[in-house]
Amino acid sequence: LPAQVAFTPYAPEPGSTCRLREYYDQTAQMCCSKCSPGQHAKVFCTKTSDTVCDTCRPGWYCALSKQEGCRLCAPLRKCRPGFGVARPGTETSDVVCKPCAPGTFSNTTSSTDICRPHQICNVVAIPGNASMDAVCTSTSPTRSMAPGAVHLPQPVSTRSQHTQPTPEPSTAPSTSFLLPMGPSPPAEGSTGD
């Protein structure tokens, strides 16, 4: 008779390991399904029920990933005015921001916008800087503007410019987390920033 296929969760045979895309849950003492990269374990497995996976919400990424899935979803960084996206965020990595180089600008607070070139003017009314496009005196620039470049001056942020910008001030996703002592941290002596 062929061996039966074991469906998760199941107790592994003594001396054996869990299969590919499974992990051994110490609490349940069972082989359970891993969540796919970028997903988090919404509900961890028990002796009778398998892992329930969920993705981090749009605009968030997995900051703390583990073999059983994501432990902590976090909002993607937003690059402030004067800074653009150097490396986009992925399911498991945050956005990396960089200062806009001379001749480029970003006037948005965004987790997707890159630095764009200043428009080229016949006569410059206001020179561009890292957080503002150039303003021309003539009605149109000599060369076609970069796609999406702005004609009118934008308000310059008065806040200090950080290369580590603002996450969304929205409510966190409900992530289940295995704590050492139930709902509260241990007496002596957590995860996140």
Epitope: L64, L72, A172, T175, F177, L179, P186, G189, S190, D193
Partner: antibody
Framework: EVQLLESGGGLVQPGGSLRLSCAAS????????MSWVRQAPGKGLEWVST???????YYGASVRGRFTISRDNSKNTLYLQMNSLRAEDTAVYYC???????????????WGQGTLVTVSS | QSVLTQPPSASGTPGQRVTISCSGT????????VNWYQQLPGTAPKLLIY???QRPSGVPDRFSGSKSGTSASLAISGLRSEDEADYYC???????????FGGGTKLTVLG
């Protein structure tokens, strides 16, 4: 017993470098974000940096670009590489574990005893 | 200057109730949960209250936290001499993408 033990502090000249280590024990190290918090002599607490997995890290404005946080999960150790040190970096540096039930609910729940870094010529 | 504002000192006699305030903004206290830390003289800080009003196991119920809008408070009832310490509030700040602390309040137990 859950424990964090910092090392690597000492006297360094301005412009110099130093690497702090924090050895963790008594818990599953890679389940947690880890942080560095410092306290200048006679002053209050100042957050320095936090790391989650990989290079998912955050830095305080006063150290960004000079300090680098990293972790070695196989060694249960957290590091802080401090470059271009200044007199104002003189402080006791604490390693702290970050408890998280969600992004909005986080706290430093375990602290080490601290290691003193003195930047002086 | 600290992002979160605390009174530099507070005092009370044994058995009294003392409250320490912590004032912030919409990007820190209002948007995120507040934690309180106790630092006894010559020791490392210890988590006292997390998630606005939760006590870790081992922290006496004489300590309680509350939050309203952009302000938070730590209350200590039945004050004891061993409560003499520095107390710090802290919260994540969305605008700074970092943790911010209050300047600390030195609590003195009189008598």
């Amino acid at each position: 017993e859950v424990q964090l033990l910092e090392s690597g502090g000492g006297l360094v000249q301005p412009g110099g470098s130093l690497r702090l280590s924090c050895a963790a024990s008594g818990f599953t190290f890679d389940d947690y974000g880890m942080s560095w918090v410092r306290q200048a002599p006679g002053k209050g607490l100042e957050w320095v940096s936090t790391i989650y997995s990989g290079d998912n890290a955050y830095y305080g404005a006063s150290v960004r670009g000079r300090f680098t946080i990293s972790r070695d999960n196989s060694k249960n150790t957290l590091y802080l590489q401090m470059n271009s040190l200044r007199a104002e970096d003189t402080a006791v540096y604490y390693c702290a574990r970050v408890y998280s039930s969600s992004w909005r609910k986080r706290a430093f729940d375990i602290w080490g005893q601290g290691t003193l870094v003195t930047v002086s010529s | 200057q600290s992002v979160l504002t605390q009174p530099p000192s507070a005092s009370g006699t044994p058995g009294q109730r003392v409250t320490i305030s912590c004032s912030g903004t919409s990007s820190n206290i209002e948007s995120n949960t507040v934690n309180w830390y106790q630092q006894l003289p010559g020791t490392a800080p210890k988590l006292l209250i997390y998630s606005d009003n939760q006590r870790p196991s081992g922290v006496p119920d004489r300590f309680s936290g509350s939050k309203s809008g952009t302000s938070a408070s730590l209350a200590i009832s039945g004050l004891r001499s061993e409560d003499e310490a520095d107390y710090y509030c802290a919260a994540w700040d969305d605008s700074l993408s970092g943790w911010v602390f209050g300047g600390g309040t030195k609590l003195t137990v009189l008598g």
